[in-house]
Amino acid sequence: WSSKVLMSSANEDIKADLILTSTAPEHLSAPTLPLPEVQCFVFNIEYMNCTWNSSSEPQATNLTLHYRYKVSDNNTFQECSHYLFSKEITSGCQIQKEDIQLYQTFVVQLQDPQKPQRRAVQKLNLQNLVIPRAPENLTLSNLSESQLELRWKSRHIKERCLQYLVQYRSNRDRSWTELIVNHEPRFSLPSVDELKRYTFRVRSRYNPICGSSQQWSKWSQPVHWGSHTVEENPSLFALEA
């Protein structure tokens, strides 16, 4: 798959119409076969994957993806230069960091090259589609005899752009205690029981200062603190997803 640049008319949305007549829209039939929806996620602001369900096509079809930004010097659609494949059929596009502009409307066009009228144009706010990496380097330290501090790190994304969800529980707890921590990668637990063993984990999302992503990262690797005696009920301590 080669990268191409398509000239775009002033209104790419008109170009995507099937019929350009004065017929009232209620008499216009949509394409017999709708194109699959494109779903994009920006992974840690390092790369973006835009994917579609290629198996929804009744015949194996290599759909093409073109994209541009609403406000850009070069107001042309650019073809994906790195397609993702599922069973040898295009099912997505990976876009590299240098092509990601979080705060401009992302315009993405999916097209059937064998039926050029079969195309769909979607618009996306990329700042709401960021999924951070899981927090790393979780470290625990004693602030006092009974007070613990948990710290962690996030790679490549400014801390002020992230919101964190911290979960912890002891070996005596059936469920996690959780709380939201905004922008500061630290959390202190004022009272811990040294006879219990605690487990902590953290995940993050790009919200609410720099974007409004609802997607949480994966959970960090858990860290433990406290008594290393055998739990009374080890099954309670198993980490659920």
Partner: nanobody, 126 residues
Framework: QVQLQESGGGLVQAGGSLRLSCAAS????????MGWFRQAPGKEREFVAC???????FYADSVEGRFTFSRDNAKNATYLQMNSLQPEDTAVYYC????????????????????WGQGTQVTVSL
């Protein structure tokens, strides 16, 4: 299947405002991407505004800052508030919908929409 019905069109002087409504019946709009399009006599149908059911809203350059798209899922309706209207805004305005799987899907291509209203005439005079 959803049915859509626009209302609120009319004759207005340049600089004036109108609020178009698009009422849906038959099914909830809560998982529909919605759009507004317009067609002036002898011209191609043109994208005006669209949204996703997740809350993202987008506008054509020609109306950005003047028009506001909103939806009220409780009333099963969408609205297009049009301010600072100009003669070039004169057209039949159509509301359109498409069921979508993803909260972020917003279509600006008219052939992506499966349900259309009958349209409402907006005329802006000098």
């Amino acid at each position: 299947q959803v049915q859509l019905q626009e209302s609120g069109g009319g004759l207005v002087q340049a600089g004036g405002s109108l609020r178009l409504s698009c009422a849906a019946s038959g099914r909830t709009l809560s998982r529909y991407a919605m759009g507004w399009f317009r067609q002036a006599p002898g011209k191609e149908r043109e994208f005006v505004a669209c949204d996703s059911w997740g809350g993202d809203t987008f506008y054509a350059d020609s109306v950005e800052g003047r028009f506001t798209f909103s939806r009220d899922n409780a009333k099963n309706a969408t609205y297009l508030q049009m301010n600072s209207l100009q003669p070039e805004d004169t057209a039949v305005y159509y509301c359109a919908g498409a069921p979508t799987s993803f909260a972020t899907t917003a279509y600006s291509s008219s052939n992506s929409y499966t349900v259309w209203g009958q349209g409402t005439q907006v005329t802006v005079s000098l």
